[in-house]
Interface confidence: low
């Protein structure tokens, strides 16, 4: 599927370039596995240029294929602390709303490690809200070089 | 923040596309935790197109948001060799000069693994020099498919 | 090396933007370590826009520098299952044809983990076929959020 003639000659602004890199704000209350994110120059090196935050969750504002990436490091962690739990700590990135498009995009378990990091290409649509669910009893580090979450629009 | 009208219609060359993928050259002397990188077609599949090397460290020549990625594999490594050290081997990628902009961008520990890999989006400015510090007693593999470091300019 | 004047003003279609994200179809027969991939909207969130599949292997149709990324999660896996094997389970992504360009691009071992994920920038040429070889006795998960493989054209 190639770009249509109309798309080809448009100025770059119309092509998107939506991009965001977020840092961890806080975890959710007891029964809420979601991580809550924040972004903006005042906070350091995080930013939102196109996407927006809705109660700590990332909302997409432009259709397209995105590169989604994440790194989460567990705080107060050693290989024994991750391995001694019967149910391993798991991170899942997915579309959580609208409910009709709910799907898990990316899932990783920590096993005997204290950091997970991955990335993938995925189509996202305007209005998709991405949630990052951390299940297990261990808490994530809020250090901005250890835990971050971002998206980059790469093509229509 | 959208592209200004002036930026939108410029030829692609002026928009950057700076990119580099480096392979490990050598580690530093005793008290220097930095990894020293090299790049160029004669070396294999590494390259620099825009950024440059300054004594084995990567220097940015164009302002923008970059995707920074790295993979480091430890040589002569097993899960026991990484876990038996009291202080885990850690890799940190950061801006090391100019000193006024010094900051850690990306940090990972090996714990019971022998490879770390991650990526993140970050704003970088012309003149920023990126350093990759490997702390601990274990040495990195120089195999070009196991250890590499790269940046890709993604937008102004 | 900058874009030539001729390249700079071309419509975006001619600049490439080739992209693919694949999901695991099946593993190979006994002596074939390759993973076989599939992609297309009917299968979920996988797609091919430019590259093509040849018997489950990804073939490049446009010269350029690509970001190659992969995540593979082992099925029925625990840290003990990965660590108790004398030869660790290893994943390698490489150019497997044409034979004259055969090379390993990206290699990771699972050690005590159950998931590997990484990415790298690499020059690829029209006709290059990428193979992903999983060596060892453990099998990969076919869950689309746990195992995926993709490429993204990023510049000429």
């Amino acid at each position: 599927q190639r770009l249509s003639r109309a798309q080809q000659q448009l100025p770059l602004e119309s092509l998107g370039w939506d991009i965001a890199e977020l840092q961890l704000n806080h975890t959710g209350p007891q029964q809420d596995p979601r991580l809550y994110w924040q972004g903006g120059p005042a906070l350091g090196r995080s930013f939102l240029r196109g996407p927006e935050l809705d109660k700590g969750q990332l909302r997409i504002r432009r259709d397209g294929i995105y590169m989604v990436h994440i790194q989460v490091t567990l705080a107060i962690c050693s290989s024994t602390s991750t391995s001694r739990h019967h149910h391993p700590t798991t991170l899942a990135v997915g579309i959580c709303s609208p409910a009709s498009r709910s799907i898990s995009l990316l899932r990783l378990s920590f096993h005997q490690g204290c950091t997970i990091a991955s990335q993938r290409l995925t189509p996202l649509a305007r209005g998709d809200t991405l949630c990052t669910n951390l299940t297990g009893t261990l808490l994530p580090s809020r250090n901005t070089d250890e835990t971050f979450f971002g998206v980059q629009w790469v093509r229509p | 923040q959208r592209l200004s009208r002036a930026q939108q219609q410029l030829p692609l060359e002026s928009l950057g596309w700076d990119i580099a993928e480096l392979q490990l050259n050598h580690t530093g002397p005793q008290q220097d935790p930095r990894l020293y990188w090299q790049g160029g077609p004669a070396l294999g599949r590494s390259f620099l197109r825009g950024p440059e090397l300054d004594k084995g460290q990567l220097r940015i020549r164009r302002d923008g948001i970059y995707m920074v990625h790295i993979q480091v594999t430890l040589a002569i490594c097993s899960s026991t060799s990484t876990s038996r050290h009291h202080h885990p081997t850690t890799l940190a990628v950061g801006i090391c000069s100019p000193a006024s902009r010094s900051i850690s961008l990306l940090r990972l520990s090996f714990h019971q693994g022998c490879t770390i890999a991650s990526q993140r989006l970050t704003p970088l400015a012309r003149g920023d020099t990126l350093c990759t510090n490997l702390t601990g007693t274990l040495l990195p593999s120089r195999n070009t498919d196991e250890t590499f470091f790269g940046v890709q300019w993604v937008r102004p | 090396q900058r874009l030539s004047r001729a390249q700079q003003q071309l419509p975006l279609e001619s600049l490439g933007w080739d992209i693919a994200e694949l999901q695991l179809n099946h593993t190979g027969p006994q002596q074939d370590p390759r993973l076989y991939w599939q992609g297309g909207p009917a299968l979920g969130r996988s797609f091919l826009r430019g590259p093509e599949l040849d018997k489950g292997q990804l073939r490049i149709r446009r010269d350029g520098i690509y970001m190659v990324h992969i995540q593979v999660t082992l099925a029925i896996c625990s840290s003990t299952s990965t660590s108790r094997h004398h030869h660790p389970t290893t994943l390698a992504v490489g150019i497997c044809s044409p034979a004259s360009r055969s090379i390993s691009l990206l290699r990771l071992s699972f050690h005590q983990g159950c998931t590997i994920a990484s990415q790298r920038l690499t020059p690829l040429a029209r006709g290059d076929t990428l193979c992903t070889n999983l060596t060892g006795t453990l099998l990969p998960s076919r869950n689309t959020d746990e195992t995926f493989f993709g490429v993204q054209w990023v510049r000429p």
Partner: antibody
Framework: QVQLQESGPGLVKPSETLSLTCTVS??????????WSWIRQPPGKGLEWLGY???????NYNPSLKSRVTISVDTSKNQFSLKLRSVTTADTAVYYC??????????????WGQGTLVTVSS | EIVLTQSPATLSLSPGERATLSCRAS??????LAWYQQKPGQAPRLLIF???NRATGIPARFSGSGSGTDFTLTISSLEPEDFAVYYC?????????FGGGTKVEIK
């Protein structure tokens, strides 16, 4: 275009020190990429690698000569030098300086000087 | 150290013929093998690096192949200027070593 030029005495007495300098033009010995090397070739025989120096001053020598050889670099003059101590007639050879392209585990040589014949004789 | 053995020591061929030169390593050097051409009174010239990559400015009639311990330099059709001595060299392990050379002479 990178050019290398060897210079030094063509005759050295046994037990003395052979000293040669290589001047680099069209390129910098301070480059991150290259390993500045010395290679020799006895008359009618094959090539033998002696050692290299990197811009940082790190060196690597052929173990067969390690106790006798020193390579140094002068970045201000864009030169690097070879010293071979306690020479014997077996050290009579054409000595080449060359630029090594590769990495610290090994290089191949993409630019060479034209070579200088050094004869060890009393 | 890694010993490189070149064969044959001498190859007598006519212009236009195909030349096949062999280099065998005493242990694996992966693909880290280079080939050089040397003419009388001149310095060696790099032809091929890392087994199969032609150096800048080298004609397409020169090609290299092999990996591990067995390598081949092929000159598809000999030109008069190709008659020379050819050396292989490994950069897999220190010390760097060269083969003993193969002389390609006019028949």
């Amino acid at each position: 275009q990178v050019q290398l030029q060897e210079s030094g005495p063509g005759l050295v007495k046994p037990s003395e020190t052979l000293s040669l300098t290589c001047t680099v033009s069209g390129g910098s010995v301070s480059s991150d990429y290259y390993y500045w090397s010395w290679i020799r070739q006895p008359p009618g025989k094959g090539l033998e690698w002696l050692g290299y120096i990197y811009y940082s001053g790190s060196t690597n020598y052929n173990p067969s000569l390690k106790s006798r050889v020193t390579i140094s670099v002068d970045t201000s003059k864009n030169q690097f030098s070879l010293k071979l101590r306690s020479v014997t007639t077996a050290d009579t050879a054409v000595y080449y300086c060359a630029r090594g392209d590769g990495d610290f585990m090994g290089v191949c040589f993409d630019y060479w000087g034209q070579g200088t014949l050094v004869t060890v004789s009393s | 150290e890694i010993v490189l053995t070149q064969s044959p020591a001498t190859l007598s061929l006519s212009p236009g013929e195909r030349a096949t030169l062999s280099c065998r390593a005493s242990q694996s050097v992966s693909s880290y093998l280079a080939w050089y051409q040397q003419k009388p009174g001149q310095a060696p010239r790099l032809l091929i690096f890392d087994a199969s990559n032609r150096a800048t400015g080298i004609p397409a009639r020169f090609s290299g192949s092999g990996s591990g311990t067995d390598f081949t330099l092929t000159i598809s059709s000999l030109e008069p200027e190709d008659f020379a001595v050819y050396y292989c060299q490994q950069r897999s392990n220190w010390p760097l070593t060269f083969g003993g050379g193969t002389k390609v002479e006019i028949k």
